[in-house]
């Protein structure tokens, strides 16, 4: 795995411990919480990031709140089980043996049950809608400039292939970014849209996951884009299975 050789850190994930104990004395970085080796040339999976977040000291954790509006976080933060590739296991359980099924971005998609609950497969989230509302500005941003800047951001900062940014819609003050990535479209090495969306969400909140970089300074033709509300919605390849008695917290 590649990492900055000089000071042995992971540029794409600050929630890691790195040391020069890889093959040939190369820098190797492991995610906090899971101890799994991570590839520092690309984004770390959301599952490993959540696990690392939950392993942080409690007082540090309170500094990073779950997204209060996004439907993704109805159940708040939890300590997930990740598979050997760092993906969410289809079934998640807590310490009191309450279990539920999740999708590929770790969002609950069934009612909660007990240890007998079966989750046959990890259902893929293939469409993500990121809904941003920006703070008032002197005038509307130019749609083409905004579109280009957001596509550049996802390509360069999050290493997401441009073909997965399906659309950028804008009517002041609302910006919608649609990410689409079917199972058949995602090749080996492609960044997952769920991981890109999670890094973006944390960036927007001023909680960047990148090592040592300044926070996200989003500008459109020099004009700062300041976000006042962020909502992220997920659409799965197979619809979720909630009963009529679904909790309405």
């Amino acid at each position: 795995h590649t990492a900055a050789q000089d000071n042995c850190t992971c540029p794409t994930n600050k929630m890691t411990v790195c040391s020069p104990d890889g093959p040939g004395g190369r820098c190797q970085c492991r995610a906090l919480g899971s101890g799994m080796a991570v590839d520092c040339s690309t984004l770390t999976s959301k599952c490993l990031l959540l696990k690392a977040r939950m392993s942080a000291p409690k007082n540090a954790r309170t500094l990073v709140r779950p997204s209060e509006h996004a439907l993704v976080d109805n159940d708040g933060l939890y300590d997930p089980d990740c598979d050997p590739e760092g993906r969410f296991k289809a079934r998640q359980c807590n310490q009191t043996s309450v279990c539920w099924c999740v999708n590929s971005v770790g969002v609950r998609r069934t009612d909660k049950g007990d240890l007998s609950l079966r989750c046959d497969e990890l259902v893929r989230t293939h469409h993500i809608l990121i809904d941003l509302r920006h703070r008032p500005t002197a005038g509307a941003f130019n749609h083409s400039d905004l579109d280009a800047e957001l596509r550049r951001l996802f390509r360069e900062r999050y290493r997401l292939h441009p073909k997965f940014v399906a659309a950028v819609h804008y009517e002041q003050p609302t910006i919608q970014i649609e990410l689409r990535q079917n199972t058949s479209q995602k090749a080996a090495g492609d960044v997952d849209i769920g991981d890109a969306a999670y890094y973006f969400e944390r960036d927007i909140k001023g909680e960047s996951l990148f090592q040592g970089r300044g926070g996200l300074d989003l500008r459109v033709r020099g004009e700062p884009l300041q976000v006042e509300r962020t909502l992220i919605y997920y659409l799965d390849e197979i619809p979720p299975k909630f009963s009529m008695k679904r909790l309405t917290a």
């Epitope: 509006h69 809608l129 809904d131 819609h169 609302t174 919608q176 509300r229 919605y233 997920y234 659409l235």
Partner: antibody
Framework: QLQLQESGPGLLKPSETLSLICTVS????????WSWIRQTPGKGLEWIGW???????NYNPSLMGRVTMSVDTSKNQFPLKVNSVTAADTAVYYC?????????????WGQGTMVTVSS | QSALTQPASVSGSPGQSITISCTGT?????????VSWYQQHPGKAPKLMIH???NRPSGVSNRFFGSKSGNTASLTISGLQAEDEADYYC??????????FGGGTKLTVL
């Protein structure tokens, strides 16, 4: 000029399923949030939920489990289904478009369709 | 029981100003600048008069003015006219990512 038109049966029996369709004409269904709102006789407005043109939905928790919204971009329609209706579901049902891609203000409304639930 | 509280009725004479209040909590009206106001004449669909607390859509008279202080939003109508007689509803985005409406206020022009 974008217009919305609600259609569907006006009379239902308790426990039946309410099915309404909102047809969008004079414009595209793309990228907007499309809401259903109802108004019970002599009472105020109640937000039922919205669907985005992508198919993503958000429902009022008080109706969760009974409501299903879908979208048919080829027909420029977004249907509403409410299961297991009771007399409390008797209302005028409106479909509406979110203003400028937002989900919390509605600039274009249908004329509304009255639905009565009675045995 | 509506999530947002409005007076059941208000009245005023032609030419006067009236104000309709809409009281919520810090989880809706107080927490966001996403308050809207609608006018509804009998047998008609609601019409958007104010959005984002104080913004008027094009075509809405500048006699309609929206504002907010704390957990209470207000709609002020100046130079009252006979055609302003209608029901008025406020709405607000909420912290649970839903939309709440007020119970409505009947405006009578005397």
């Amino acid at each position: 000029q974008l217009q919305l038109q609600e259609s569907g049966p006006g009379l239902l029996k308790p426990s039946e399923t309410l099915s309404l369709i909102c047809t969008v004409s004079g414009g595209s269904i793309s990228s907007h949030y499309w809401s259903w709102i109802r108004q019970t006789p002599g009472k105020g407005l109640e937000w039922i939920g919205w669907i985005h043109s992508s198919g993503i939905t958000n429902y009022n928790p008080s109706l969760m489990g009974r409501v299903t919204m879908s979208v048919d971009t080829s027909k420029n329609q977004f249907p509403l289904k409410v299961n297991s209706v009771t007399a409390a579901d008797t209302a005028v049902y409106y479909c509406a478009r979110g203003l400028r891609l937002t989900d919390d203000a509605f600039d274009i409304w249908g004329q509304g369709t009255m639905v009565t639930v009675s045995s | 029981q509506s999530a947002l509280t409005q007076p059941a009725s208000v009245s005023g004479s032609p030419g006067q100003s009236i104000t309709i209040s809409c009281t919520g909590t810090s989880s809706d009206v107080g927490g966001y600048n996403y308050v809207s106001w609608y006018q509804q004449h009998p047998g008609k669909a609601p019409k958007l008069m104010i959005h984002d607390v104080s913004n008027r859509p094009s075509g809405v008279s500048n006699r309609f003015f929206g504002s907010k202080s704390g957990n209470t939003a207000s709609l002020t109508i100046s130079g009252l006219q006979a055609e302003d007689e209608a029901d008025y509803y406020c709405s607000s985005y909420t912290s649970s990512n839903t939309l709440a409406f007020g119970g409505g206020t009947k405006l009578t022009v005397l």
